[in-house]
C-alpha cells in the first residue's frame, strides 16, 4: 500500500506562437482544479476505462479574472498535493491522465459550470520510494509542469511497496537474513510467512510457504547442518539425505530474464539487466516508445514511430541512465585541479579554488611570488599555490625575517657538540666520530669509514659544515 503524489507547478501558455486566450474574463471569473487518473502501465484499456490504480481531484484554485488585453499568464493553482492512495503493490509502470478543469463562477443557473480545459496523458516508469520526478506536458497551446512520486505507507517498503517493515526486536541488528529498512534504519524488514517449521535462523523465503536455506544448512526446514567434507560442489540446493551441498540449479540457471535480458546472481536471488525497451523483474515489460515520453529530466527521445519501436534517450548535461533518470555525480570525475573543491549546482559545475589557483577548473597557478619579498637575501620559490622563501644561511621563517638558530635541530650526530657560527654551524665530534655532522665512525686502526678525512684535518677535530 502507498500513495501516489502529484504536485502541479504551473499551468499556462506553452512556448511558441499562438498563445491561448485566457480561460477567464472579467465577465466570467473562473478558477482551476485538476483531476488525475492512474492505471497500471500495461493496461490495454482505452482512455475511457476506469482508473484502476485510483483517481483524485484537487481543491479549487484561487478565483482568477483576466486583465483585459493581457496574454494568458500562468494561472493561479490550488494549494497542496493531489494524492492517490493505492492499496496493493505499486506496479512500477503506470499510465496517467491529468485533466485541467475550469470552474466558471458567473451567474449560471444551477451553480457553477465546469469545462475541460486541457488533458495530458502518458506512461511512465517509477519506483516507489524514489525522488520526485519532474515532467512537462503540452496540450494544444497549454503547458502543464508537474512533479510526481510514489511512496509506501508503513509498514510497506521497497520499490513496489511489497516488503514490510517492523520495529527492531534487538537494538543492535536485524534478525538473520533480514535487512534494515532503508530509509527507516531503526526498523527491520519483516519476514514473509515461510513454510511452517522453517528454521528462523537458517532459512528464509522469497515466496510465502517456501523454505530456502542459508549457506551451510540443508533439509526441508533448513535444520540440518551441511557437512562439506565429502561434497563436490560448493553450491546448493541442499540435499537432505547426505547433508551435502550438491550441484543444483542456481537462480540464473535457465535464464529467468526474458527478451534477451542477462541474469546475474545476488545473495538472495537474481537480477536481470534488461535490453533497451524492456524492464521489470524479468524484463517482461515492453512496449514503451517515445510516444510515452520515457525520457526524464528533459531528455530527448529518439526512436521510430511504430508501436514496437525502441527508443534512445539523449540526456541533458548532469543526467544519465537509459531514461535520463539518474543524476550524474559530476564531481566524482574530479574536474577541479590543484585540490579545488567541486560544487555541482545542477545547472553547472563550480570549482572553489585553493589560494594561489584560479580559473574555471583551478587550472591556473597564480604567480605566488608576485609582490612577495623574502628578507635578508632570501629567494622566493613558487609552488603548491603558496610562495615559499629559501632563506640565506642564518635566517629562517616564512619571510626569512627570523634569525635562525642552526643548532636548534640538533644536527650533530653521535653526541657531537653544535656551535653556531656566522656562516652556519660547526660540529665538534665526540671521540671516535668524524665528518661535517659527526656521522662517520673512526676505525680503531686510524682509518676512517668512507669518505676519508680531508687532508689537514685529524679525526676528532671540529669540522666546519660548509
Amino acid at each position: 500500500a502507498g500513495v501516489f503524489e502529484l504536485q502541479i507547478h504551473s499551468f499556462g501558455p506553452g512556448p511558441g506562437p499562438g498563445a491561448p486566450r485566457s480561460p477567464c474574463s472579467a465577465r466570467l471569473p473562473c478558477r482551476l482544479f485538476f483531476r488525475v487518473c492512474l492505471k497500471p502501465g500495461l493496461s490495454e484499456e482505452a482512455a475511457e476505462s476506469p482508473c484502476a490504480l485510483g483517481a483524485a481531484l484537487s481543491a479549487r484554485g484561487p478565483v482568477y479574472t483576466e486583465q483585459p488585453g493581457a496574454p494568458a499568464p500562468d494561472l493561479p493553482l490550488p494549494d497542496g498535493l493531489l494524492q492517490v492512495p493505492f492499496r496493493d503493490a505499486w506496479p512500477g509502470t503506470f499510465s496517467f491522465i491529468i485533466e485541467t478543469w475550469r470552474e466558471e463562477l458567473g451567474d449560471q443557473i444551477g451553480g457553477p459550470a465546469w469545462s475541460l480545459l486541457a488533458r495530458v496523458a502518458g506512461r511512465r516508469r517509477l519506483a516507489a520510494g524514489g525522488p520526485w520526478a519532474r515532467d512537462i506536458q503540452r496540450a494544444g497551446a497549454w503547458e502543464l509542469r508537474f512533479s510526481y512520486r510514489a511512496r509506501c505507507e508503513p509498514p510497506a517498503v521497497g520499490t513496489a511497496c511489497t516488503r514490510l517493515c517492523r520495529p527492531r526486536s534487538a537494538p543492535s541488528r536485524c534478525g538473520p537474513g533480514l535487512r534494515p529498512c532503508a530509509p527507516l534504519e531503526d526498523e527491520c524488514e519483516a519476514p514473509l510467512v515461510c513454510r511452517a517449521g522453517c528454521s528462523p535462523e537458517h532459512g528464509f523465503c522469497e515466496q510465502p510457504g517456501e523454505c530456502r536455506c542459508l549457506e551451510g544448512w540443508t533439509g526441508p526446514l533448513c535444520t540440518v547442518p551441511v557437512s562439506t567434507s565429502s561434497c563436490l560442489s560448493p553450491r546448493g540446493p541442499s540435499s537432505a539425505t547426505t547433508g551435502c551441498l550438491v550441484p543444483g540449479p542456481g537462480p540464473c540457471d535457465g535464464n529467468p530474464c526474458a527478451n534477451g535480458g542477462s541474469c546475474s546472481e545476488t545473495p538472495r536471488s537474481f537480477e536481470c539487466t534488461c535490453p533497451r525497451g524492456f524492464y521489470g523483474l524479468r524484463c517482461e515489460v515492453s512496449g514503451v516508445t517515445c510516444a510515452d515520453g520515457p525520457c526524464f529530466n528533459g531528455g530527448l527521445c529518439v526512436g521510430g514511430a511504430d508501436p514496437d519501436s525502441a527508443y534512445i534517450c539523449h540526456c541533458p548535461p548532469g543526467f544519465q541512465g537509459s531514461n535520463c533518470e539518474k543524476r550524474v555525480d559530476r564531481c566524482s570525475l574530479q574536474p577541479c585541479r590543484n585540490g579545488g573543491l567541486c560544487l555541482d549546482l545542477g545547472h553547472a559545475l563550480r570549482c572553489r579554488c585553493r589560494a594561489g589557483f584560479a580559473g574555471p577548473r583551478c587550472e591556473h597557478d597564480l604567480d605566488d611570488c608576485a609582490g612577495r619579498a623574502c628578507a635578508n637575501g632570501g629567494t622566493c620559490v613558487e609552488g603548491g599555490g603558496a610562495h615559499r622563501c629559501s632563506c640565506a644561511l642564518g635566517f629562517g621563517g616564512r619571510d626569512c625575517r627570523e634569525r635562525a638558530d642552526p643548532c636548534a635541530a640538533r644536527p650533530c650526530a653521535h653526541g657531537g657538540r653544535c656551535y653556531a657560527h656566522f656562516s652556519g654551524l660547526v660540529c665538534a665530534c665526540a671521540p671516535g666520530y668524524m665528518g661535517a655532522r659527526c656521522e662517520f665512525p673512526v676505525h680503531p686502526d686510524g682509518a676512517s669509514a668512507l669518505p676519508a678525512a680531508p687532508p689537514g684535518l685529524r679525526p676528532g677535530d671540529p669540522q666546519r659544515y660548509l
Partner: antibody, heavy 121, light 112 residues
Framework: EVQLVESGGGLVKPGGSLRLSCAAS????????MSWVRQAPGKGLEWVGR??????????DFAAPVKGRFTISRDDSKNTLYLQMNSLKAEDTAVYYC????????????WGQGTLVTVSS | DIVMTQTPLSLPVTPGEPASISCRSS???????????LDWYLQKPGQSPQLLIY???NRASGVPDRFSGSGSGTDFTLKISRVEAEDVGIYYC?????????FGPGTKVEIK
Amino acid sequence: EVQLVESGGGLVKPGGSLRLSCAASGFIFNNAGMSWVRQAPGKGLEWVGRIKNKIDGGTTDFAAPVKGRFTISRDDSKNTLYLQMNSLKAEDTAVYYCTARGWYGDYFDYWGQGTLVTVSS
Amino acid sequence: DIVMTQTPLSLPVTPGEPASISCRSSQSLLHSNGYNYLDWYLQKPGQSPQLLIYLGSNRASGVPDRFSGSGSGTDFTLKISRVEAEDVGIYYCMQALQTPFTFGPGTKVEIK
C-alpha cells in the same frame, strides 16, 4: 531546413527496372523510419513499403502488390534511401514519395516532393 | 490488411464554418500501449501530403489549433473548427498500427 529529394524517376517499359533515390538533409536520417508512398495519377495515396531505423533492426516491409518485386535499402552514411523496382507493370505508374517519420524529441513526419515513374510500352 | 473507409468523400464547406470528416478502420487501431495508431494528412492541390494529426489526437508541429482529432478503436474524426480558404485539398486518414500501412480513400474538401 528539412529536405527529402527523390530522383531516378522516368519512363520505363513493362518488365523493366528502375532505382529511385531519396537524398535526405536537415534532420538526423539514421533515427528515422523511411517509407515509400505512391500516388497513381488522379488517385489516392498507396503505401509501398518501409525500412526501419537501425535500432529497430533495419527490417523492411512491403505492400502486397509490390512484394517480391521491389526492395528498399538505406545508406545512413550518405543519408540516402533507395527503392529498387523490378518487373515493373503499367499499374506501378505513379508519383513516388519518400517519407521519413519517427521521434526526435517531438514527432516528425516529412515528405519529399515526389518523382514520377511511368511504365508504358 | 486493415481497410480504411472515409465519409464523406466530398465535402463542400463555407469559410468560417466548422467541418468534420469521419474515418473508420476494419479493426481496432488501439494498441495495448494505449495509443491509437491513426494519422491524418492533408494534400493541398499540387503539393505533397502533410501530417496534421498523429496517434489519433495529437496535432503535428506547426498545425493550426483549428484542427483536432478524436476517436478510439475503429472510429475517428477530424474536425476543423473554422474552415479557412487554405484548408482546401484532400484529407486522408492512415493506419500505422501494422504493415502494410493503409490509407483511406480521401475526402475532398472544397469551398462552396
